[in-house]
């Protein structure tokens, strides 16, 4: 059986990830995890700075 | 066509180790995650974790439940992947099922019976 | 973990009629990136092992035939059957794979009258 693309791109897609589509890519880490597991930042504090919401490339079939 | 077949279960007394193998055919083993799953007779199911493809490193994710006591590991040049069950107990008695996992547990096989008993 | 509770526990019905069987998680499986609710169910005929019938709660896998139907959001999911076959005899699992551990209900037992 030959496998399928895993994700399919288009014009201004991200590129595909290499996680299976039950999974997200965590790009703070670099590694596939539960989508779950990826969580939007918290809203800061007033003042306060914080980096960057961690995000997620996630396949579609 | 995927196929899965477990084997390797049987009989094992209390705090003993077994080894259950999943053979593989009809796809290309490295390039999917594999899953064990298992079902307690007359019970639901409970997912005990898996192996992820050589994409991503061959890591691994285990239930809590069994973390420490189960190692999930591949033989990829044999399209064998195992479930390496140390120090078990009677609750662990169960049919065990191999799955490919892809959009969900998408292929399954047939299973093998594991009974922990003096 | 996420709890997922399922019911009703069993249900006998005749060949022809609908049935809805529900599942509910104890958090959204909802990934707001995506849209996506990572709900599967599965279906174990007697002596077989477990088939998947639908991921990402409302897709149906290629060959599921069309009267087996997933839908919900966030907590709450319905499994639908529009007409049943007696072939349809089997015990239908929910399962979440948003977060690890990945975890099943305990089953809905579909018995025909």
């Known amino acids: 059986m030959r496998r399928g693309p895993r994700s399919l791109r288009g014009r201004d897609a991200p590129a595909p990830t290499p996680c299976v589509p039950a999974e997200c890519f965590d790009l703070l880490v670099r590694h596939c995890v539960a989508c779950g597991l990826l969580r939007t930042a918290r809203p800061k504090p007033a003042g306060a700075s914080s980096p960057a919401p961690r995000t997620a490339l996630q396949p579609q079939e | 066509e995927v196929k899965l077949v477990e084997s390797g279960g049987g009989l094992v007394q209390p705090g003993g180790s077994l080894r259950l193998s999943c053979a593989i055919s009809g796809f290309t083993v490295t390039a999917y995650y594999m899953s064990w799953v298992r079902q307690p007779p007359g019970k639901a199911l409970e997912w005990l974790g898996f192996?992820?493809?050589?994409?991503?490193?061959?890591?691994?994710e285990y239930n809590p439940s069994v973390k420490g006591r189960f190692t999930i590991s591949r033989d990829n040049s044999q399209s064998i992947f195992y479930l390496q069950m140390n120090t078990l107990r009677a609750e662990d008695s169960a049919t065990y099922y191999c799955?490919?996992?892809?959009?969900?547990?998408?292929?399954w096989g047939q299973g093998t019976t594991v009974t922990v008993s003096a | 973990d996420i709890v997922m509770s399922q019911s009703p526990s069993s249900l006998a019905v005749s060949v022809g009629e609908k049935v809805t069987m529900s599942c509910k998680s104890s958090?959204?499986?909802?990934?707001?990136?995506?849209?996506?609710?990572?709900l599967a169910w599965y279906q174990q005929k007697p002596g077989q092992s477990p088939k998947l019938l639908i991921y990402w709660a409302s897709t149906r896998e290629s060959g599921v035939p069309d009267r087996f139907t997933g839908s919900g959001s966030g907590t709450d999911f319905t499994l639908t059957i529009s007409s049943v076959k007696a072939e349809d005899l089997a015990v239908y699992y929910c399962q979440q794979y948003y977060t690890y551990p990945y975890t099943f209900g305990g089953g809905t037992k579909l018995e025909i009258k």
């Open positions: 799955a490919q996992v892809r959009r969900a547990l998408d292929y």
């Open positions: 192996i992820r493809d050589k994409a991503n490193g061959y890591t691994t």
């Open positions: 958090q959204s499986l909802l990934y707001s990136s995506n849209q996506n609710n990572y």
